[in-house]
Amino acid sequence: EEELQVIQPDKSVLVAAGETATLRCTATSLIPVGPIQWFRGAGPGRELIYNQKEGHFPRVTTVSDLTKRNNMDFSIRIGNITPADAGTYYCVKFRKGSPDDVEFKSGAGTELSVRAKPSAPVVSGPAARATPQHTVSFTCESHGFSPRDITLKWFKNGNELSDFQTNVDPVGESVSYSIHSTAKVVLTREDVHSQVICEVAHVTLQGDPLRGTANLSETIRVPPTLEVTQQPVRAENQVNVTCQVRKFYPQRLQLTWLENGNVSRTETASTVTENKDGTYNWMSWLLVNVSAHRDDVKLTCQVEHDGQPAVSKSHDLKVSAHPKEQGSNTAAENTGSNERNIY
């Protein structure tokens, strides 16, 4: 009679992570008597996957009933496959011996490849806010995918970005891979409502890329523009001066009025109005009693925005002449105006 052969008909098997892998194996003879064992890998370091004779292998089931006397099908199913299960599996026939069974013949091996989906991309931006015209970096990471081939794209508000660098690790063979990409984005004043999107496409995703997003509202700081104007006289000796704080983001803002360099009042922006682009406007006013001043008054609106150094705008209030009704842009009002930026 011809000597027993162990046949593994599949050179390779490909499954998705989470699926069940079927590893086929048949013997050509019932003789010699002895059990079958499945191993991952060859040589002394091989890992026992299934032993027909003894042991507990909760993830492994046999395709046929191995207790039947004439059974020659030793195929197994391995459930809930992960990338760590990848490798070459050998079906090995043992001959009954005393005290131990002796390895008789091995199959040619079946290479199990596992395809695993990438994790949802995580996008992170800079630790500190930046102002328009500055370039900021965003990173995108996704892990645990196999095979290595993967496509990553960056978008800002639906427009594809080109200034980015991507690495897939490790460089050599591995059961699974990770991708890391850094994109450079130039901020504009209109970016409060903008989104940066990292899109990852992989064969396991069935054509539905995974996306990670970052809102530029968490990255951008739009500094305010200030305008100090003198309003028409409200009473004989009172002048209303307003400070318009425009187009700022985020909302965190503190305003201080100074009269001739002395703090008159400090307030925090509360009832702001929101612009279409997501920035805010706010107005503060100061009622100045002209009769309390002998000389001209220098009024300064000083704004500290989002913990940044204060910016200020001043307005010279003439008290020598009788105050008359003035518009917000009269020559007299602008004469002594100046703007100081402190960085």
């Epitope: 390779s12 490909l14 998705a16 395809r115 095979p147 081939d149 496509t151 064969v203 396991t204 995703l205 069935q206 054509g207 539905d208 890329p209």
Partner: antibody, heavy 118, light 109 residues
Framework: EVQLLESGGGLVQPGGSLRLSCAAS????????MSWVRQAPGKGLEWVSI????????YNADSLKGRFTISRDNSKNTLFLQMNSLRAEDTAVYYC???????????WGQGALVTVSS | QAVVTQESALTTSPGETVTLTCRSS?????????ANWVQEKPDHLFTGLIG???NRTPGVPARFSGSLIGDKAALTITGAQTEDEAIYFC?????????FGGGTKLTVL
């Protein structure tokens, strides 16, 4: 057993429209990207379109210039191809095919013949 | 658009090993092109044999294998049988679309 069954083919005049269906059985449609591929008489295969597993993303052959639209109803396990402004050169057998892992045309239907002629 | 080129016809004998190739006009075929091989038998019967360069569809005989040879994708039939007589199409993926080759008519005499 995986089966794909196309229907809706027939004779249509140039400029007309036709909607092909592909009824899938033996698997859950939403777990797979699906494709339409056509074969003109005596010619080779030409890829037409892909619908992603969710149906949210589509990939189309540039040559069709937006005349064909792929869609799916995952609840009914059915894939569709809406063909508008048909031309004589669109005459072909249209096949739906399943994509395993998005990179593997593993199962094909038997095809639906579309003839565009006046 | 890329052009995918295959041998128009090949002839082999039963038991012989035959290799069909698939070339891309854009350069070397890589694993990112996810080479597919599809068999057409009479009466428009199509079967997906190989996907993703080298993965055999369940139920397809082990004598069919896919690989990259040099700058081309290849389908090798080890020990061809008379029932393997058919037309074989390869398909390559280019970022957002597939392109099929013209097909190879394989005769097994």
């Amino acid at each position: 057993e995986v089966q794909l069954l196309e229907s809706g083919g027939g004779l249509v005049q140039p400029g007309g429209s036709l909607r092909l269906s592909c009824a899938a059985s033996g698997f859950t449609l939403s777990s797979y990207a699906m494709s339409w591929v056509r074969q003109a008489p005596g010619k080779g295969l030409e890829w037409v379109s892909i619908s992603s597993g969710s149906g949210a993303n589509t990939y189309n052959a540039d040559s069709l210039k937006g005349r064909f639209t792929i869609s799916r109803d995952n609840s009914k396990n059915t894939l569709f191809l809406q063909m508008n402004s048909l031309r004589a050169e669109d005459t072909a057998v249209y096949y739906c095919a399943r994509l395993r892992f998005f990179d593997w045309f593993d199962y094909w239907g038997q095809g639906a013949l579309v003839t565009v002629s006046s | 658009q890329a052009v995918v080129t295959q041998e128009s016809a090949l002839t082999t004998s039963p038991g012989e090993t035959v290799t069909l190739t698939c070339r891309s006009s854009t350069g070397a075929v890589t694993t990112s092109n996810y080479a597919n091989w599809v068999q057409e038998k009479p009466d428009h019967l199509f079967t997906g044999l190989i996907g993703g360069t080298n993965n055999r569809t369940p139920g397809v005989p082990a004598r069919f294998s896919g690989s990259l040879i040099g700058d081309k994708a290849a389908l090798t039939i080890t020990g061809a049988q008379t029932e393997d007589e058919a037309i074989y199409f390869c398909a390559l993926w280019y970022s957002n679309h597939w392109v099929f080759g013209g097909g190879t008519k394989l005769t097994v005499l």
